[in-house]
C-alpha cells in the first residue's frame, strides 16, 4: 500500500513522462543558478514536501536529485544561511522500507549521512552543513532542478 506522498510522487512523475519532449536546455533560465550540468532554483517561500514536489513539476523541473556526496557538498556551498532548510527529492518509502528518490531509485547508503529517523511520512531536507529527516508536512523551502543538455561536437560524415 502506497502512502499519499508516494502516490503524489508517482502521479507527478507519470504526468511529466507523458508530456511532449521539449528541446534541450543549453543555458540556465534567468533566476536559476547553474551548478555543473544542472540549473537550480532555490525557493523563497515555504511548503510541505508534496507541495514543493508539485511546484517543481509546474516549473517543468523536479525536486533536487543528488547523485553523490560531491554534488551534495557543491549544493550546500550555495546555501549561505545556516538556519535555512530545503526539501530535496528524497522521501521514505513505507512499502519498501527504504529512502527513495522521486525518479524511483533508492538511496545508496554511503551517499548521504541522514540525521533523524527513517520512518513513514519522513522526507529529506538539506542545510548548509547537514542532511535531515523531517516530517513531510513540515513547511520549509525547497530546491528545483533542471538538467542542462550537454553540447556534443557534431561529427560530420566525409562528403
Amino acid at each position: 500500500q502506497k502512502s499519499s506522498i508516494e502516490k503524489c510522487s508517482v502521479d507527478i512523475q507519470q504526468s511529466r513522462n507523458k508530456t511532449t519532449e521539449r528541446p534541450g536546455l543549453l543555458n540556465c533560465p534567468i533566476y536559476w543558478q547553474q551548478l555543473r550540468e544542472k540549473c537550480l532554483l532555490f525557493s523563497h517561500t515555504v511548503n510541505p514536501w508534496n507541495n514543493s514536489l508539485a511546484d517543481c513539476s509546474t516549473k517543468e523541473s523536479s525536486l533536487l536529485l543528488i547523485r553523490d556526496k560531491d554534488e551534495l557538498i557543491h549544493t550546500q556551498n550555495l546555501i549561505r544561511d545556516k538556519a535555512i532548510l530545503f526539501w530535496i527529492g528524497l522521501n521514505f518509502s513505507l512499502s519498501e522500507k527504504n529512502w527513495k528518490w522521486i525518479n524511483g531509485s533508492f538511496l545508496n547508503s554511503n551517499d548521504l549521512e541522514i540525521r533523524g529517523d527513517a520512518k513513514e511520512n519522513s522526507c529529506i531536507s538539506i542545510s548548509q552543513t547537514s542532511v535531515y529527516s523531517e516530517y513531510c508536512s513540515t513547511e520549509i523551502r525547497w530546491i528545483c532542478q533542471k538538467e542542462l543538455t550537454p553540447v556534443r561536437n557534431k561529427v560530420y560524415p566525409d562528403s
Partner: antibody, heavy 116, light 111 residues
C-alpha cells in the same frame, strides 16, 4: 517592512567608475535577488542587473562589459560599479528587491551626474 | 532583447472613470519554468516606482483592488476601474522572461 537606501557620490567624472551601495534593512539579504535599475532624467527605466545572495549575477547585455554587482551579506548590502562612464550614464539609480521579476521594494533613488 | 511596447503614451482620464493601459511584448513572456513574469509599476511624480501587479494579475500587498491586470502570451492590460487623484503618474510594464526590460511608460493624468 523591507527598506532599501542607496548611497554614493552624486558626481562622477567621465571615464571614471561610478560606485553605489544599497543597504537593506528590515529583512535579510540572504534570500531573493537584488537589482539595480536606472532612469535618465525625464526618461524611462532601464534594468542594469541583479545579484543573488550567493553571489551569482546577471547583467543587462548592453552594459555587461562595464558593470560589476557584488554583495556583502554580513553588512546586508549590495553594490554597483559602472566603469568608463559618459554623460549618457547620468541618471537616478535605484536599488530594488527582485522577487523573480517582481521588483517589490525600491530605494528612493540617488541622482548620479557624469560631468567634468 | 524583448521589446515592450505600451499604448497609449498618455491617457487623460476623468476622476471616477476607468482607465486601461496596453502592453505588448515582441515575443512570448512564458518563462521556461511555466510562469509569465509580467509586472506593472506605478511611478508618481518625484517618487521611485512602486509594484502594483506581478505575474500578470497578482496584486501586490497594499495595492487597491481598483487595479487589475490581465493578458497572456504577448498581450497584457492594466485596468484602473475608477481613477482617483492619487493614481496620477507614469505606469510601466516590465517583463522578466529573459533579462528584464520595461515598456516606455504611459502617463495617466486627470482631464
Amino acid at each position: 517592512q523591507v527598506q532599501l537606501q542607496e548611497s554614493g557620490p552624486g558626481l562622477v567624472k567621465p571615464s571614471e567608475t561610478l560606485s553605489l551601495t544599497c543597504t537593506v534593512s528590515g529583512g535579510s539579504i540572504s534570500s531573493y535577488y537584488w537589482s539595480w535599475i536606472r532612469q535618465p532624467p525625464g526618461k524611462g527605466l532601464e534594468w542594469i542587473g541583479y545579484i543573488y545572495y550567493i553571489g551569482t549575477t546577471n547583467y543587462n547585455p548592453s552594459l555587461k562589459s562595464r558593470v560589476t554587482i557584488s554583495v556583502d551579506t554580513s553588512k546586508n548590502q549590495f553594490s554597483l560599479k559602472l566603469s568608463s562612464v559618459t554623460a549618457a550614464d547620468t541618471a537616478v539609480y535605484y536599488c530594488a528587491r527582485d522577487r523573480m521579476g517582481a521588483l517589490d521594494y525600491w530605494g528612493q533613488g540617488t541622482l548620479v551626474t557624469v560631468s567634468s | 532583447d524583448i521589446v515592450m511596447t505600451q499604448t497609449p503614451l498618455s491617457s487623460p482620464v476623468t476622476l471616477g472613470q476607468p482607465a486601461s493601459i496596453s502592453c505588448r511584448s515582441s515575443q512570448s513572456l512564458v518563462h521556461s519554468d511555466g510562469n509569465t513574469y509580467l509586472s506593472w509599476l506605478q511611478q508618481r511624480p518625484g517618487q521611485p516606482p512602486r509594484l502594483l501587479i506581478y505575474e500578470i494579475s497578482n496584486r501586490f500587498s497594499g495595492v487597491p483592488d481598483r487595479f487589475s491586470g490581465s493578458g497572456a502570451g504577448t498581450d497584457f492590460t492594466l485596468k484602473i476601474s475608477r481613477v482617483e487623484a492619487e493614481d496620477v503618474g507614469v505606469y510601466y510594464c516590465m517583463q522578466a522572461a529573459q533579462f528584464p526590460t520595461f515598456g516606455g511608460g504611459t502617463k495617466v493624468e486627470i482631464k
